[in-house]
Interface confidence: low
């Protein structure tokens, strides 16, 4: 029987009346061309909605916008356009919301052609009031807040100037000219690239990387011959041009650019690219594009210094620079990532790793599903997940995979069951154990979201026709109730819930169309009365993450430790609540070969836990560059996985000797760096 329709599915009591009492409609008094929605702060209930409408005239485009504010999670909205003097807001800059709970908002206005600079509207009280400020420059990018101090803003101008404000946009100072890219680092540090000759494009590969730690009082050149740079976790990466040819290599720094090491990654040519897929304070997933227009590359995982890399996954799907990859961090379970590979026959298959890239496997076939037409063997196939690539190819996939850190183990995604991703209409699948096992949750494509830390899952069917029904589940997608939230169906445009999945409110956005009028409308449904009571101890059960063999003493050991979680019982219909904190009990495991990645010069054959020497490096001394000095590596092929906490057990030998030799291959050696002050 279809999911949610078997006899054991209990109905949630009186949910129609409860949801009816908690369904709030807001009809916006206009239909604007686009709607953008931003949450201001965490748990504040404040939402800003900007509707914009472009009126194309013969010579120019005239714009109008309206700004609405809610302070009750979208149940009611107030038109606050007058607070911004009815000014047209530029949607390409969006609404710049300050970090954490600063309550800061910056809106960038459209100004007439001949003006000296742009205009912004600033609020530091969760958009209750705005201050208009005229800028001494025309912004090219959205204002960027320092993560450490929301009063510090940076922006690039259309003239490629780097502008900084120390008082939340009240006064601005140009700290550098000829800037291509600027980013905040930690401790209010700004990293930026500059060009010397023509332009950013002309000087690509000849850019300089600069750093200022005092908001532009003094500067340090920390890199030359730069193609691009990026920040990930505690790592600073620079893509640097080689001296002799057009290839470039990744260099990495863990001290804000004071010293650099060349990453042991293949160099790339002009048409290729590097991409940081994911990074944390322990390690980095790096994609290195294959030569030629293949649409794939190789994933490498780093050591704890970001220098030595192991090949993690071949034929990783990643179309072009800035293109599409399906790489997804499953945030609901430690160590889990999902992505797609391009097979030799050009079909696309989904792979999953449970140990941070150590080993990749296919997704287990859901028990309640049959293999589709792509399967050669109708009894043996896998689940394949639709993500960014499928969406970019305009397949009938309304949403990418979804997981939330506080909804432990839950992953929801569109997929098909076969030997590869299918272009047929997908269904929605759910895993409640971080991707080990899957179940078909809903037939056909849907929008979905997680509320109350997993206590409720909400879904809306993806349809070209107007809709008026929402589905919800209180048991992690096993059983579904449907609720008609409006008599008059609406053309659905999106589901919105507060980031973090702690809320119990969901907003359904769309527009109504009748003969004469077209209006944006939102329905906010509060599920608080469905989950009538607060969860108690008895509502939770102990769950061992990554458990695959309960008989095994080491069951659940991933990255050197196992974790037991307190998880809500599927049968419990209660509120985790906004203050819910995931309860977990870690315990250290004995080391095994699974706790080690293959060291530089070694690789792991498929389905083998042993690391063997790369044939091309057999008999060679393993030497590599570290902080501009040549190092000699003595290894039997293993290095501990970054973040692995195992103790005892297997302990492979690994020793690094300083050869006291300078590396000629390191373009970012310290003596090439210089400092200057303003």
């Amino acid at each position: 029987s279809a999911p949610g329709e078997d006899e054991e599915c209990g109905r949630v009591r009186d949910f129609v009346a409860k949801l009816a009492n908690n369904t709030h409609q807001h009809v916006f008094d206009d239909l604007r061309g686009s709607v953008s929605l931003s949450w201001v702060g965490d748990s504040t209930g404040v939402i800003l909605v900007l509707t914009t409408f472009h009126v194309p005239l013969v010579i120019m485009t005239f714009g109008q916008s309206k700004l609405y504010r809610s302070e009750d999670y979208g149940k009611n909205f107030k038109d606050i356009t007058d607070l911004i003097n009815n000014t047209f807001i530029r949607t390409e800059f969006g609404m710049a919301i300050g970090p954490e709970n600063s309550g800061k908002v910056v809106l960038t206005a459209e100004v007439s052609g001949g003006s000296r600079g742009g205009r912004i509207f600033r609020s530091s009280d969760f958009a209750k009031n705005f201050v208009q400020t005229d800028l001494p420059f025309h912004p090219l990018t959205q204002m960027m807040y320092s993560p450490q101090n929301s009063d510090y803003l940076l922006a690039l101008s259309t003239e490629n100037g780097l502008w900084v404000s120390k008082n939340f946009g009240g006064k601005w100072e140009e700290i550098h000219k000829a800037v291509c890219l600027a980013k905040w680092g930690s401790d209010n540090t700004i990293f930026f690239t500059t060009y010397a000759n023509g332009s950013c494009k002309a000087d690509l590969g000849a850019l300089e990387l600069w750093r200022t730690s005092d908001l532009g009082k003094s500067f340090k050149t920390i890199g030359v011959k730069i193609y691009s740079f990026g920040l990930g976790g505690r790592f600073l990466f620079a893509s640097v041009m080689a001296d002799k040819d057009t290839t470039r290599r990744i260099h990495v720094s863990t001290d804000q650019g004071d010293t650099w090491s060349m990453a042991q990654l293949p160099s790339v040519g002009q048409e290729q690219f590097y991409s940081i897929l994911a990074a944390n304070d322990d390690m980095v997933f790096m994609h290195v594009d294959e030569p030629g227009d293949t649409g794939f590359g190789t994933i490498f995982t780093s050591d704890d210094r970001g220098i030595v890399y192991s090949k993690s996954l071949d034929r990783h799907l990643y179309t072009t620079t800035g293109g599409e990859t399906d790489f997804t961090n499953v945030t609901s379970l430690r160590g889990v990532y999902i992505t797609s590979v391009l097979s030799e026959d050009n079909s696309i298959q989904t792979m999953i790793t449970f140990d941070q890239g150590g080993r990749w496997t296919h997704l287990r076939k859901p028990e309640n599903s049959e293999c589709d037409a792509t399967a050669k063997n109708k009894n043996e196939c896998s689940l394949h997940i639709h993500a960014s690539y499928s969406i970019s190819q305009k397949l009938n996939v309304p949403m990418a995979p979804l997981s939330e850190p506080n909804a432990v183990g839950i992953v929801i995604a569109h997929g098909s069951v076969g030997d590869a991703i299918s272009v047929m209409v997908p269904d929605v699948y759910i895993s409640d154990d971080g991707g080990y096992s899957w179940t078909k949750m809903l037939e056909g494509p849907h929008y979905y979201t997680i509320l109350d830390s997993g206590g409720i899952i909400v879904a809306i069917e993806h349809s070209s026709r107007p809709i008026n029904v929402i589905k919800f589940s209180t048991d992690e997608g096993q059983c579904w109730q449907t609720y008609t939230f409006t008599r008059d169906p609406i053309y659905f445009t999106g589901l919105a819930s507060e980031p973090g999945a702690r809320s119990m409110n969901i907003s359904i956005w769309g527009f109504t169309e009748s003969f004469l009028t077209s209006q944006w409308v939102s329905y906010t449904i509060d599920f608080k009365d469905i989950l009538e009571r607060n969860c108690e101890e008895k509502d939770y059960t102990i769950w061992l993450a990554h458990s695959t063999d309960p008989e095994d003493y080491e069951d659940g050991c991933i990255l050197g430790y196992k974790e037991q979680f307190l998880r809500l019982r599927k049968s419990s219909v209660c509120q985790n609540g906004r203050d819910y904190v995931v309860t977990k009990q870690p315990s250290i495991c004995l080391c095994s070969l699974e706790d080690f990645l293959c060291d530089f010069g070694y690789y792991r054959p498929e389905n083998d836990s042993k690391c063997v020497e790369q044939p091309e490096l057999k008999g060679h001394d393993l030497e590599f560059c570290l902080y501009g000095r040549e190092e000699h590596l003595t290894t039997n092929g293993y290095r501990k996985i970054p973040g692995d906490k195992c103790q005892g057990g297997v302990n492979p030998v690994r020793e690094v000797k300083d050869l006291k030799k300078k590396c000629t291959s390191n373009f970012l050696s310290p003596e090439k760096q210089n400092s200057k002050s303003n």
Epitope: A20, N21, H24, T486, R487, D529
Partner: antibody, heavy 124, light 106 residues
Framework: QVQLVQSGAEVKKPGSSVKVSCKAS????????ISWVRQAPGQGLEWMGG????????SYAQKFQGRVTITADESTSTAYMELSSLRSEDTAVYYC?????????????????WGQGTTVTVSS | DIQMTQSPSTLSASVGDRVTITCRAS??????LAWYQQKPGKAPKLLIY???SLESGVPSRFSGSGSGTEFTLTISSLQPDDFATYYC????????FGGGTKVEIK
Amino acid sequence: QVQLVQSGAEVKKPGSSVKVSCKASGGTFSSYAISWVRQAPGQGLEWMGGIIPSFGTASYAQKFQGRVTITADESTSTAYMELSSLRSEDTAVYYCARQGRKTGYYYYYGMDVWGQGTTVTVSS
Amino acid sequence: DIQMTQSPSTLSASVGDRVTITCRASQSISSWLAWYQQKPGKAPKLLIYKASSLESGVPSRFSGSGSGTEFTLTISSLQPDDFATYYCQQADGHITFGGGTKVEIK
């Protein structure tokens, strides 16, 4: 102006069933909840159950669970209440009432439109 | 189910009097309470919804207040047309009515 018109009075034998209809006219029917409320002679009001026609799923008071069935036919804008295994205590006036007032969404605004009532007498 | 207790069950008053009827819920029902007026042989009529919102067409002498478990219907100045039976009704979960308060002429 919405009106709810109920079927005529019924006299029934104990153990039998009765089905009362409630037809909406002059307004929308589907988006509202229709409740059934009864009132025994000289007694107070007692909610039996209700349905949102466009939704189709009925909700019943525990006391009547298993004995009452509430349905709705959107095409004729009619709601029905069937009570089985009648006993003399079921002698009462049965009302249908509309609840929910805002077009476009449901919200509990009380039962704002009532039918004229149908008298059901259970007697042997 | 939630029980609704209305008091008093009978109330004698004169025209012009200020009349107060109380309704207590066995557990919190937020503001999901309505008040009705019923005259003999007639269907009930909605007066107040959501504890304090006056139904359109209802005279302003009727007002409702309260939330959680304690609710009050007040008729500020009793008129001849107001002699009737009044019911409270909760809508948090299954619907239940109070036992009724009969307002009669003193």
